[in-house]
């Protein structure tokens, strides 16, 4: 299709080389099409103008994204060629930063229902650059935490070193929805609730004598509880003896509950005691089996390919630890009779 009629928007993504960050592009179809099509400010059926130039589908995922190759080749379907880019409804998510993401991205509706719809498209020219200036050492992170029940704030990473007075007007989005009341480089939250968690996008306009472009940053905000004051507790094994059959394989599971810690480095491991000897066993990786705001349950198994007479004289010890302290639970194997 002919993209010369598409509305054009220029965006700049300046990424930090020190941290992982994501980026998003919204399919900003021209008003009033956008609102009807992508439900960003959804109109009720009564409000739909009679002669809307583009009668879009109500299916939120019914947009098609393309990349325009710089060599003039035909447009490429994003989904087929770029595994690190994911389409979610009307949004394009870039999972990894890098200058190779620079380029022109075009979005348009999948269903073309009238002649007017052909020109219903947006071309976004994205420029991606690594952050070079070290002048702002403490720029806000692209991952920010809000403590539940307290006051907090979300800072726009690309503007966090500027005072509120010098800061340009900022447009904020939360999970793709425009936050119309927020215009500063910082969103202040009087009391943090779990619904404040989400993906925030902050945009501001920068211009020079030739052109203007939108500078965008994405912030992943999570709501957290305060760090635990407790060492982890072992939920399983509960008993200190286990009946087993000689010569048969055996799996002993260790499940432990770790309270929330912002810097979370849980340790869960198995070791064996045999008379005055003690050694750690290489076992399958630990896995998280339940995660809530307050705590996480982690499991790690020890696998005995078969139980031997010697194993009946050994103790199998599960050891768990967090920054507060450690807990152990030992299991003695006992031969099943009859």
């Amino acid at each position: 299709f002919n993209i010369s009629g598409c509305s054009t928007k220029k965006l700049l993504w300046t990424y930090s080389t020190r941290s992982e960050e994501e980026f998003v592009l919204f399919c900003d179809l021209p008003e009033p099409q956008k609102s009807h099509f992508c439900h960003r400010n959804r109109l009720s059926p009564k409000q739909v103008p009679e002669h809307l130039p583009f009668m879009g589908s109500n299916d939120l995922s019914d947009v098609q994204w393309y990349q325009q190759p710089s060599n003039g080749d035909p447009l490429e379907d994003i989904r087929k060629s770029y595994p690190h880019i994911i389409q979610d409804k009307c949004t394009l998510h870039f999972l990894t930063p890098g200058v190779n993401n620079s380029g022109s991205y075009i979005c348009r509706p999948k269903m073309i229902k009238s002649p007017y719809d052909v020109a219903c498209c947006v071309k976004m020219i994205l420029e991606v650059k690594p952050q070079t200036n070290a002048s702002c050492e403490y720029s806000a992170s692209h991952k920010q935490d809000l403590l539940l029940g307290s006051t907090g704030s979300i800072s726009c990473p690309s503007l966090s070193c500027q005072s509120d007075a010098q800061s340009p007007a900022v447009t904020w989005y939360k999970n793709g929805k425009l936050l119309s009341v927020e215009r500063s480089n910082r969103i202040v939250v009087d009391e943090v609730y779990d619904y404040h968690q989400g993906t925030y996008v902050c945009d501001y306009t920068q211009s020079d004598t030739v052109s203007s472009w939108t500078v965008r940053a994405v912030v992943q905000v999570r709501t957290i509880v305060g760090d635990t004051k407790l060492k982890p507790d072992i939920l399983d094994p509960v008993e200190d003896t286990l009946e087993v059959e000689l010569g048969k394989p055996l799996t002993i599971s260790c499940k432990a509950r770790f309270g929330f810690e912002r810097v979370f480095n849980p340790v869960i491991k198995w070791y064996i005691k045999d008379s005055d000897l003690e050694w750690e066993v290489s076992v399958p990786e630990a896995k998280s089996i339940k995660s809530t705001l307050k705590d996480e349950i982690i499991e790690r198994n020890i696998i005995l390919e078969k139980v031997t007479q010697r194993d009946l004289r050994r103790k199998f010890v599960c050891f768990v630890q967090n920054s507060i302290g450690n807990t152990t639970q030992s299991v003695q194997l006992k031969e099943k009779r009859g």
Partner: antibody, heavy 120, light 110 residues
Framework: QEQLEESGGGLVQPEGSLTLTCTAS?????????ICWVRQAPGKGLEWIAC???????TYYASWAKGRFTISKTSSTTVTLQMTSLTAADTATYFC?????????????WGPGTLVTVSS | DVVMTQTPASVSEPVGGTVTIKCQAS??????LAWYQQKPGQPPKLLID???TLASGVPSRFKGSGSGTQFTLAISDLDCADAATYYC????????????FGGGTEVVVK
């Protein structure tokens, strides 16, 4: 008297295949025994290849043997080792061994070995 | 995979003497270690299991010790019948199963 005996060795062409058989006499492979294959190139040391748990049929291989070697329990008294894509480096005496069953993983009973020569 | 390193490759001692063979594991294997004796033209014979437990019928002149990553086989009061190659083997379970052998030590009795 408990014994193991290997058979099936001999001369094989490079890139060829061969199946070795380990036969037990005086006992059968009960559930707690593991039967394993170990090889020894002329004048060299012992090299573990693979084991099979007689009860569960679970198999264990040395990392270098995965893909080219397959251990199977074919009856209560026989275990085989299938070898494919053989090269001169596979020339060796192949031993089958039985572990200690309930008493552990060390190999308490060995066969006399069978010689495999890979040559054109 | 666990790698077993045996030293020395060869050792020569007179009848009545003592030989010490060392075996090092690339990771902590506790006491999951066996020692074997092999004479030319014969299959190996189990001497010691669990680093220090003598197999049945093995004379007490053979002594295994060590744990973790460092293991030793000592043969005292050497006899001509002890001339053979000795191998250590890791009999370690954990994630999967490993049964690696050391490179062997040839014992010559003068």
């Amino acid at each position: 008297q408990e014994q193991l005996e290997e058979s099936g060795g001999g001369l094989v062409q490079p890139e060829g295949s061969l199946t070795l058989t380990c036969t037990a006499s005086g006992f059968s492979f009960s559930s707690s025994y593991w039967i394993c294959w170990v090889r020894q190139a002329p004048g060299k040391g012992l090299e573990w290849i693979a084991c099979i748990a007689a009860g569960s049929g679970s198999t264990y291989y040395a990392s270098w043997a995965k893909g080219r070697f397959t251990i199977s329990k074919t009856s209560s008294t026989t275990v085989t080792l299938q070898m494919t894509s053989l090269t001169a480096a596979d020339t060796a005496t192949y031993f089958c061994a039985r572990d200690l069953g309930d008493d552990g993983y060390a190999y308490g009973l060995w066969g006399p070995g069978t010689l495999v020569t890979v040559s054109s | 995979d666990v790698v077993m390193t045996q030293t020395p490759a060869s050792v020569s001692e007179p009848v009545g003497g003592t030989v010490t063979i060392k075996c090092q594991a690339s990771q902590n294997i506790g006491n999951n270690l066996a020692w074997y004796q092999q004479k030319p033209g014969q299959p190996p014979k189990l001497l010691i299991d669990y680093a220090s437990t003598l197999a049945s019928g093995v004379p007490s002149r053979f002594k295994g010790s060590g744990s973790g990553t460092q293991f030793t086989l000592a043969i005292s009061d050497l006899d001509c019948a002890d001339a053979a190659t000795y191998y250590c083997q890791c009999t370690f379970y954990g994630s999967g199963y490993v049964a690696a052998f050391g490179g062997g030590t040839e014992v010559v009795v003068k």
